[in-house]
């Protein structure tokens, strides 16, 4: 277990022409804050993949208002470190993502507005326990200067925080209730398995199965306090000869950390290391918070205003849900008109239009007849977003470009023979039939059931279909 720490030194316009004066120009006052996201390994991960190693959000920086005449300064930054606790081994290779966010404080409808100013993504190798690594990165017109390190939380040590420490020698000659003046040197190795029941606080072992007691404790499992001590009887508060201190009220006395958090003293104060699922200065906050990086797909996590409100994820366009985990089905709104097919490409919507329509949303009805689409004397009939050609005799096909064979459909009835003619077809009827398509029988007594044939045509003559 350990903590990844990031210190932002400065954020401001980069060198060179065209750099912005400030993030707030013409927008009224604003302030900055930062989000750090850690992902394991060096592979190129999708931007929306979760911050598997952890994430953290800084406090808001001081409010900044641009002074029109003043030279562009480095922008006022939030105080303190960004800390990302990690529970398991430190991977050594990781992706570091630092986002700079702007919070606009002008009169916004619906409260403050957040926008991402800059995002730096770098793949890094870093051993835990090493010195601060310094870096300068440019993101667009902005420049970010920062330092970072990974450190183990005792008893874990080593470059991956996987080895555990135990005291090398007897801790001190201090009795119960007294503590050593100086920190002990650590010897680090995988600890042996002690005798079952051996006190975790007051016992240790160098060989499997044994239980050796720290000074001031006795008994087979080191659970019995010893009544005498080399430090007892001292009049003053400390003694250099024995190296023992009578403890004053230390900042960790009374255990200020809630929910099983472990307390460690810092100069003039204390620090709680919280178990997973607990947060806050004293581990008093339960459940999932912004420190877990719960907002997916680039959503911005903002803590709630009162102690019980959950965080809020501000989702980027195209995503919704309490954790921005759901892709908005923008096609469900049926943005494509006139039967166009909707395609959601993630970064944009695209409409694939049916024939006869055009435009980003297929909203334009094309006049298909405008370009005289019908050949060979065909006439264009428009309708339903498409066009249809009514072709002249002897031509067919979509645009009347194909020469039609009028006899292909065998139009002459009762065995009549069909002849293609420049303006259509002619049927030569078999004996006993007449009419344009030889559809009428001729009566045996020679009297037609039809009106007399037109002048110049006798029954049996080929009849031209007009």
């Amino acid at each position: 277990a350990g903590v990844f720490e990031l210190q932002i030194h400065s954020f401001g316009p980069g060198p060179g022409p065209g750099a912005p004066r400030s993030p707030c120009s013409a927008r009224g006052p604003c302030r900055l804050f930062f989000r750090v996201c850690l992902k394991p390994g060096l592979s190129e991960e999708a931007a929306e993949s979760p911050c598997a190693l952890g994430a953290a959000l800084s406090a808001r920086g001081p409010v900044y208002t641009e002074q029109p005449e003043a030279p562009a300064p480095d922008l006022p930054l939030p105080n303190g470190l960004l800390q990302v606790p990690f529970r398991d081994a430190w991977p050594g290779t990781f992706s570091l993502i630092i986002e700079t966010w702007r919070e606009e404080l002008g009169d916004q409808i619906g409260g403050p507005a957040w926008s991402l100013l800059a995002r730096v993504t770098r793949r890094r190798r870093l051993a835990a326990g090493g010195p601060w690594a310094r870096d300068i990165q440019r993101a667009g017109a902005w420049e970010l200067r920062f330092s970072y390190r990974a450190r183990c939380e005792l008893p874990a040590v080593g470059t991956a925080c996987t080895r555990l420490c135990r005291p090398r020698s007897a801790p001190s000659r201090c009795g119960p209730g007294l503590r050593p003046c100086a920190p002990l040197e650590d010897e680090c190795e995988a600890p042996p398995v002690c005798r079952a029941g051996c006190s975790l606080e007051h016992g240790f072992c160098e060989q499997p199965g044994e239980c050796r007691c720290l000074e001031g404790w006795t008994g087979p499992l080191c659970m019995v306090p010893v009544s005498t001590s080399s430090c007892l009887g001292l009049r003053g508060p400390s003694s250099t000869t024995t190296g023992c201190l009578v403890p004053g009220p230390g900042p960790c006395d009374g255990n200020p950390c809630a929910n099983g958090g472990s307390c460690s003293e810092t100069p003039g104060s204390f620090e709680c290391t919280c178990p997973r699922g607990f947060y806050g200065l004293r581990c008093e906050v339960s459940g999932v918070t912004c420190a877990d990086g719960p907002c997916f797909n680039g959503g911005l996590c903002v803590g709630g205003a009162d102690p019980d409100s959950a965080y809020i994820c501000h989702c980027p366009p195209g995503f919704q849900g309490s954790n921005c985990e759901k892709r908005v089905d923008r096609c469900s709104l049926q943005p494509c008109r006139n039967g166009g097919l909707c395609l959601d490409l993630g970064h944009a919507l695209r409409c694939r239009c049916r024939a006869g329509f055009a435009g980003p949303r297929c909203e334009h009805d094309l006049d298909d007849c405008a370009g005289r689409a019908c050949a060979n004397g065909g006439t264009c009939v428009e309708g339903g977003g498409a066009h249809r050609c009514s072709c002249a005799l002897g031509f067919g096909g979509r645009n009347c470009r194909e020469r039609a064979d009028p006899c292909a459909a065998r139009p002459c009835a009762h065995g009549g023979r069909c002849y293609a003619h420049f303006s259509g077809l002619v049927c030569a009827c078999a004996p006993g039939y007449m009419g344009a398509r030889c559809e009428f029988p001729v009566h045996p007594d020679g009297v037609s059931a039809l009106p007399a044939a037109p002048p110049g045509l006798r029954p049996g003559d080929p009849q031209r279909y007009l």
């Epitope: 008093e284 339960s286 019980d308 965080y311």
Partner: antibody, heavy 118, light 107 residues
């Protein structure tokens, strides 16, 4: 509004197991610890353990470590507690409760009464 | 484990009384203490969190105080609906533990 639904009662035989459910609604289930508490007849409340659905982290009271197993089904916003190797000592009312941000159990289920009897 | 002790297991009270229920911890718990009410039908409600903060919807006649190892819940003007059993609970470390409960009974 926040609600935790628990079945009213379970009658089970000694030596068997029972899986109690607690269906949550009205809040983002994954983001809050779910607590389980036991109350034997005529006795006080005993904390069994807790689970954080977001990451399946659990904390158990050592006295219940071998007795209770806590799980969740995020898709149905339901927390479960399986009690194994039941004896008459396990006859009790079992409550689920949501742990608020400020580490208090702010909403409780009605409790499931478990009776172990042959 | 931290033991939580409610010395009075039952208390005879009258409506309108000012009632104080005490709870002590076997070691300092840095104000990490909550109070709960359990009605006779088994319903449990949060009253006070972090020693003295009133949970939303809880009447202002309830208040909490204390520090170190000693804590108390006060009901300033007892109403009929306050007849119930009251439990303290710490969250300083695991396991969380409850007090044995204090049952209010009408005289």
């Amino acid at each position: 509004q926040v609600q935790l639904q628990q079945p009213g009662a379970e009658l089970v035989k000694p030596g068997t197991s029972v899986k109690l459910s607690c269906e949550a609604s009205g809040y983002t289930f994954s983001n809050y610890w779910m607590q389980w508490v036991r109350q034997r007849p005529g006795q006080g409340l005993e904390w069994i353990g807790m689970i954080l659905p977001n990451s399946d982290i659990t904390n158990y009271n050592e006295n219940f470590q071998t007795k209770a197993t806590l799980t969740v089904d995020k898709s149905s916003s339901t927390a479960y507690m399986q009690l194994s190797s039941l004896t008459s000592e396990d006859s009790a009312v079992y409550y689920c409760a949501r742990q608020a941000r400020y580490s208090a159990m702010d909403y409780w289920g009605q409790g499931t009464s478990v009776t172990v009897s042959s | 484990d931290i033991q939580m002790t409610q010395t009075t297991s039952s208390l005879s009270v009258s409506l309108g009384d000012r009632v104080t229920i005490n709870c002590s911890a076997s070691q300092g718990i840095s104000n990490y203490l909550n109070w709960y009410q359990q009605k006779p039908d088994g319903t449990v409600k949060l009253l006070i969190y972090y020693t003295s903060n009133l949970h939303s919807g809880v009447p202002s006649r309830f208040s909490g105080s204390g520090s170190g190892t000693d804590y108390s819940l006060t009901i300033s003007n007892l109403e009929p609906e306050d007849i119930a059993t009251y439990y303290c609970q710490h969250y300083s470390k695991f396991p969380y533990t409850f007090g044995g409960g204090t049952k209010l009974e009408i005289k």
